[in-house]
């Protein structure tokens, strides 16, 4: 590919009060949406969209609203309870042309397992997705359909990481085309061949990941598919040739020193705002050691925090992040030893992330209980284990099979967890509560086309 | 998957230079903060040298004697090391936010 290419589609990513509220700083939220953002730019430079290559995303604008903005009557995503098609139309009802998608993330915990919603785009005659321009629908609003939501928040836990970034990918691969995966090619993980199945499904599967098996992370042939027909039509609307750092976007990129976003938003003394003249804009003001925007460990006033200061708390699986004092950056964690037990006994730390199953620890695997007439379901959200590629060894850790390594004691999975074969999640009540993918989605494209369905919010 | 791929480590004598070069397995893009750790025998590891955006930062160790840049079009990271002292002995760490350590150069300054 040339460098001339358009492959670089342009992101305005919103936050609502309570994702700001669960992060606590603006900084901690500006490096969560720039995590999320790398983690999807990865997925798909790597992935070959039937020979178009190197697709990749950067933020053009941000819109953090802070715990002030929950009363602001121009933010709105002010309200507390608001269902995930709402969300999504809040969204939506903002003109979004200035931008290949737009995205609000929230720690809001929707019905059913849902943890994002977006517009499915198409080739020809459909409205949603990558590049779709604000029109008037049928409710008599004019709405932008290039658009979607995601949520850290499930069944009252927050999903690690890796889920979230998988989530954020899944709902850009429907804007970018992707219906849900289907088909024995396309959910190897519901195979009967243990080998297919071990790998588990891909991005555009329709239920539930753990984020951590082999596909977890690739799109699916069926995928790569769809997504290559919409970029064939539709990339040339509205991607850019990729390269250019936007000053202003609150992420410090090359050719910048920092970045704390437009005049309207650059609460810091620190840095010169993206409003300035060309060779002030994203540079430190004179004498200034460094920016809030470049990391944690920079202060208010402008100097790098002193060599003892927590950046970063201590977790399940790595130390706390202590800066050093002479950058802002908060340094890497030293991660706790391997088999540490983590997320309330359920996972064991390997290299510092909380990633294996507790089975680990005594050389087992994890498997699902489920006996296939589904009398057991009561086991559904425990922790099984099975010898390695041996499914019918496959108990509970509160079964006399396990009792050596974990002595009788039922562990059950955290509310959140993926059960019965990825087919939901687990609830509070430790019940699997079994995802209906397609179901929000079909309530909205009701809801637009057909108004008289949809009931307003109240304030 | 993306992994790094440190090299360029080496055996000098003390008041060498080195460079030492990182590399990826894997595409990634906008990569805008890199840095580079060092681990000295039973010791942990500590960065010393950072690189966000345009701005460089030096551990005072290294100070005037370490200069970190980045090849913007091979998107890559490199640490350059001169007048390099026996205290300077470990192995040297590229590392990215939310990409996982690689396994290092070794660095060995002899007197």
């Known amino acids: 590919t040339t460098s001339a290419e358009k492959n670089t589609c342009q992101l305005y990513i919103q936050t609502d009060h309570l994702f700001f509220k669960y992060y606590g700083t603006r900084e901690a939220v500006i490096a969560q949406i720039s995590s999320h953002v790398k983690a999807i730019d990865t997925i798909y430079q790597t992935t070959d969209f039937s020979g178009i290559r190197n697709i990749s995303f950067m933020v053009k604008r941000i819109r953090i609203n802070t715990t002030a903005d929950e009363k602001d009557p121009t933010n709105p995503f002010r309200f507390p309870n608001i269902g995930v098609e709402k969300f999504l139309e809040l969204n939506s009802e903002q003109n979004h042309d200035d931008y290949c998608l737009a995205y609000v993330f929230t720690d809001r915990d929707f019905d059913d397992g849902v943890l994002g919603l977006a517009w499915v785009g198409a080739p020809s005659g459909s409205s949603g997705g990558i590049c779709e321009k604000s029109k008037l629908y049928s409710d008599g609003k004019k709405k932008s359909l290039n658009t979607g939501i995601i949520t850290v928040q499930n069944y009252g836990s927050h999903v690690p990481p890796k889920v979230s970034h998988i989530t954020f990918a899944h709902e850009v691969g429907h804007n970018f085309g992707s219906p849900h995966d289907s088909g024995t090619e396309c959910t190897p993980g519901e195979s009967k061949n243990l080998g297919q199945k071990e790998n588990g499904n891909y991005i555009m599967y329709a239920r539930a990941t753990s984020g951590d098996k082999l596909n977890n992370n690739k799109f699916s042939l069926c995928s790569i598919r769809n997504i290559s027909q919409v970029l064939e039509k539709k990339r040339n609307n509205c991607f850019v040739e990729s390269g250019q750092p936007i000053c202003g976007n609150g992420m410090v990129e090359q050719g910048e020193e920092c970045d704390c976003g437009y005049s309207d938003q650059c609460k810091d003394e620190c840095c010169f705002d993206a409003n300035q003249p060309e060779g002030r804009k994203c540079k430190l003001k004179p004498g200034k050691q460094c920016s809030p925007s470049q990391g944690p460990c920079c202060t208010a006033q402008c100097a790098f925090k002193s060599k003892s200061e927590k950046c970063r708390d201590d977790s399940d699986c790595a130390r706390e992040g202590i800066c050093n004092g002479f950058t802002a950056l908060c340094p890497a964690s030293d991660p706790k030893p391997n088999f540490t037990d983590c997320n309330r006994h359920t996972q064991v730390c390997i290299n510092g992330q909380c990633a294996g199953s507790i089975c680990e620890k005594y050389g087992l695997e994890e498997c699902t209980c489920a006996s296939s007439d589904g009398k057991d379901d009561k086991e559904l959200c425990h922790v099984c284990c099975m010898k390695k590629m041996d499914p019918s060894t496959c108990a509970s850790t509160g079964s006399v099979q396990w009792s050596r390594h974990f002595s009788g004691r039922t562990i059950t999975l955290q509310p959140g967890s993926p059960c019965n074969d990825f087919r939901g999640y687990c609830d509070v009540f430790m019940r699997c509560r079994l995802v209906d993918a397609d179901g929000p989605l079909a309530r909205l494209k009701k809801a637009i086309f057909s108004p008289e369905l949809y009931e307003n919010i109240a304030e | 998957e993306v992994q790094l791929v440190e090299s360029g480590g080496g055996l000098v004598q003390a008041g060498g230079s080195l460079r030492l070069s990182c590399g990826r397995s894997?595409?990634?893009?906008?990569?805008?903060?890199m840095s580079w750790y060092r681990q000295a025998p039973g010791k942990t590891r500590d960065m010393v040298a950072a690189?966000?955006?345009?701005?460089?930062n030096y551990a005072d160790s290294v100070k005037g004697r370490f200069t970190i840049s980045r090849d913007n079009a091979k998107n890559a990271v490199s640490l350059h090391m001169n007048r390099l002292k026996p205290e300077d002995t470990g192995v040297y760490y590229c590392?990215?936010?939310?990409?996982?350590w690689g396994q290092g150069t070794q660095v060995t300054v002899s007197s």
């Open positions: 894997g595409r990634i893009s906008n990569i805008n903060i």
């Open positions: 690189i966000i955006g345009d701005a460089t």
């Open positions: 590392k990215i936010p939310g990409v996982d």
